[in-house]
Structures are given as C-alpha cells and as structure tokens.
C-alpha cells in the first residue's frame, strides 16, 4: 500500500549542465494524496539553504505526480550551485535531495564541456 505522506522525488546526486542566457525549468516532483502541500525552493550556501522568495515558480500537474517548477528566465552565471525543494505537510518539513546546476557562461560557450567530459571531471565525480 502506497504511503500517503508527501514525497519529494528530486533524484539523489542529480546534476544539470546548462548555458547562461538560456531559459531553464528546475522541477521538483511532488507526490501527495489529498491537499497539495506548500512547497518552496532554496539554494544551498554551505550548510544552510537560503529560501528563494522572489523567484518565478509554477505548478505542473501530471497523472500520478505534480511538479513544482523554479523558472530561470534566463539562466545567469551566479545560478550555478545546489538547490533543494521542501514541503510543509501536517506541520512537518520534508526536504528533497539537492540537485546541482553547472552553469557555463555564454562567453566561454565555445569551450562548453560535453556531458561526458563533465562526468569525467574528478571534482564532479567525487565529493
């Protein structure tokens, strides 16, 4: 029997390689049963996660899951970093895994690494 707790399904250790200047949507998959929870995004700064108050967000509904989306229009170089979504559910705070954005500045787009090159960089492979 499926749990009726809220679940946030950001993939563990997930990464996105994106270009500055492009639009990008960061999705937080949310599973809930009855009432849609209040969900927020934050950006990691060391061990604290700073709430993103003034950013454009939206909901997208699919058959078995919903997505709380953080919009980057456009992506800026300082959007580089790790993000987490969290939900308030029955006075509990549920936090997702973090997901990391690797932003390549358009100025150096000609030297933009491929996905495989990104994966081969030791500072991305290891923590």
């Amino acid at each position: 029997k499926e749990s009726c707790d809220v679940q946030l399904y950001i993939k563990r250790q997930s990464e996105h390689s994106i270009l500055a200047g492009d639009p990008f949507e960061l999705e937080c998959p949310v599973k809930y049963c009855a009432n849609r929870p209040h969900v927020t995004w934050c950006k990691l700064n060391g061990t604290t996660c700073v709430k993103l108050e003034d950013r454009q967000t939206s909901w997208k509904e699919e058959k078995n899951i919903s997505f709380f989306i953080l919009h980057f229009e456009p992506v800026l170089p300082n959007d580089n970093g790790s993000y987490r979504c969290s939900a308030n559910f029955q006075s509990n705070l549920i936090e997702s895994h973090s997901t990391t954005l690797y932003v390549t500045d358009v100025k150096s787009a000609s030297e933009r690494p491929s996905k495989d090159e990104m994966a081969s960089r030791p500072w991305l492979l290891y923590r």
Epitope: K11, R12, H16, I65
Partner: antibody, heavy 119, light 112 residues
Framework: QVQLVQSGAEVKKPGASVKLSCKAS????????AHWVRQAPGQGLEWIGR????????KYDPKFQGRATMTADTASNTAYLELSSLRSEDTAVYYC????????????WGQGTLVTVSS | DIVMTQTPLSLSVTPGQPASISCKSS???????????LNWFQQRPGQSPRRLMH???KLDSGVPDRFSGSGSGTDFTLKISRVEAEDVGVYYC?????????FGQGTKLEIK
C-alpha cells in the same frame, strides 16, 4: 509492476563495439536513473555507470570512461549501453538496473545480456 | 575508489543455523544527508541479483525477516537468523554514497 527487458546475447570480435538495450515499463522512466552493472563469468558485480534519462547526465566508473557510452530514449523508455574496443575481459553478463524515483539504490534488475568477446 | 571488503568469502551453514557476513568500507559511508547508502544483494545460482536490504537495515519487500542488516560508518553486517535451503547463493554488499559506486567481492553461502 516494474519490468526491465534487455536485448539478446551478443558475440563480438576483439576491437569491435556492442550496443545493448534495456526497455523499461511499469514506471516513469524519466523520474529514475538507469544503471549498468556487469558480471564476468564466475566473478563479482561491477558498477559501470548510470544515466539520468531526463537530461542525459551520465556518471561512469573511471575504469569505463571513454569506452562506455550510456544513452537513453525517453520516447521509447529505453536505456542503451555501448561498449567499444572490446577485449576478451569484457565477456560478461551486463545488467541494467533501475531505482525508485532516482534514489540510486539499485531497486530493479533486468534479466541480463551475455556479451561474449572472442576471436 | 571506496573499497568494500567482505568476510568470509565463503561459508557453509547447516539449515536452521545462523549465518553472518561482514562488510567493511575503506571510508565512512555516512552521506551529507545523514543517510548511509549501504545495500545488500543476493544472487541465487543462474539468476539476476536482487536487493535484500537498503540503507543498512531496511528490509526489502518480500524478503523474509530472518534477514537483518546492521552497522554504521565503515562496518556493516548481514545476518540470517536461521539459514534455509533457498538462501544458497552469493551475497554482495554495495556502497552508493560516493562515485564510483562499488560492490564487495561477494560471499558464497552453501548449505551443509
């Protein structure tokens, strides 16, 4: 229920390439990772790497970096592993593995594909 | 890479008796999210592996409760309280905290 159906056995010559497929059903392919694990005859399990089908992001064991290429097609819910410059030591059963909502916990295993490399 | 060392590499157990497999990692497997990504897999002869235990001690669906997992940091143990004939096979520990993910070399369980 979750099902991972892998392509049939392959026999290849040293130096050749092989491309294996793994068709997923019973879950949302884009919301999970697809991993590849291999097992040489009578040997243990070896993690090759994983792909995020949603964006194509890959992670490889450095041992396979450059020789293995993982791809995914979300339209057909299929993950692929291509291994190039094959040598006899690549003779193994190759498993594709999915996890529950990207937990990276290797929840569901395919039936495996035997690749034999022989001259 | 994180090295996973299993002991013993093989064991022969009388049905009804307990069995224990140790797995040691070369580095603590405690992740920054507070979880320890250590799984145990069983591979019966001629079959694909299946997961028995995840996050050290969480029993997977359909796995008999005679199996239990324990440990923290770098030292982990899989225990079978009463071995049965269907438990024959190879058992692997696996870490998913650091890339590249790595398996132990396997422990072969036979029935006396």
């Amino acid at each position: 229920q979750v099902q991972l159906v892998q392509s049939g056995a392959e026999v290849k010559k040293p130096g050749a390439s092989v491309k294996l497929s793994c068709k997923a059903s019973g879950y949302n392919f884009k919301h999970t990772y697809a991993h590849w694990v291999r097992q040489a005859p009578g040997q243990g399990l070896e993690w090759i790497g994983r792909i995020d089908p949603a964006n194509g992001n890959t992670k490889y064991d450095p041992k396979f970096q450059g020789r293995a290429t993982m791809t995914a097609d979300t339209a057909s819910n299929t993950a692929y592993l291509e291994l190039s410059s094959l040598r006899s030591e690549d003779t193994a059963v190759y498993y594709c593995v999915a996890d529950h909502y990207g937990s990276s916990l290797l929840d569901y295993w395919g039936q495996g594909t035997l690749v034999t490399v022989s001259s | 890479d994180i090295v996973m060392t299993q002991t013993p590499l093989s064991l022969s157990v009388t049905p009804g008796q307990p069995a224990s497999i140790s797995c040691k990692s070369s580095q603590s497997l405690l992740d920054s999210d507070g979880k320890t990504y250590l799984n145990w897999f069983q591979q019966r002869p001629g079959q694909s592996p299946r997961r028995l235990m995840h996050l050290v001690s969480k029993l997977d669906s359909g796995v008999p409760d005679r199996f239990s997992g324990s440990g923290s940091g770098t030292d982990f143990t899989l225990k079978i309280s009463r071995v049965e004939a269907e438990d024959v096979g190879v058992y692997y520990c696996w870490q998913g905290t650091y890339f590249p993910y790595t398996f132990g070399q396997g422990t072969k369980l036979e029935i006396k």
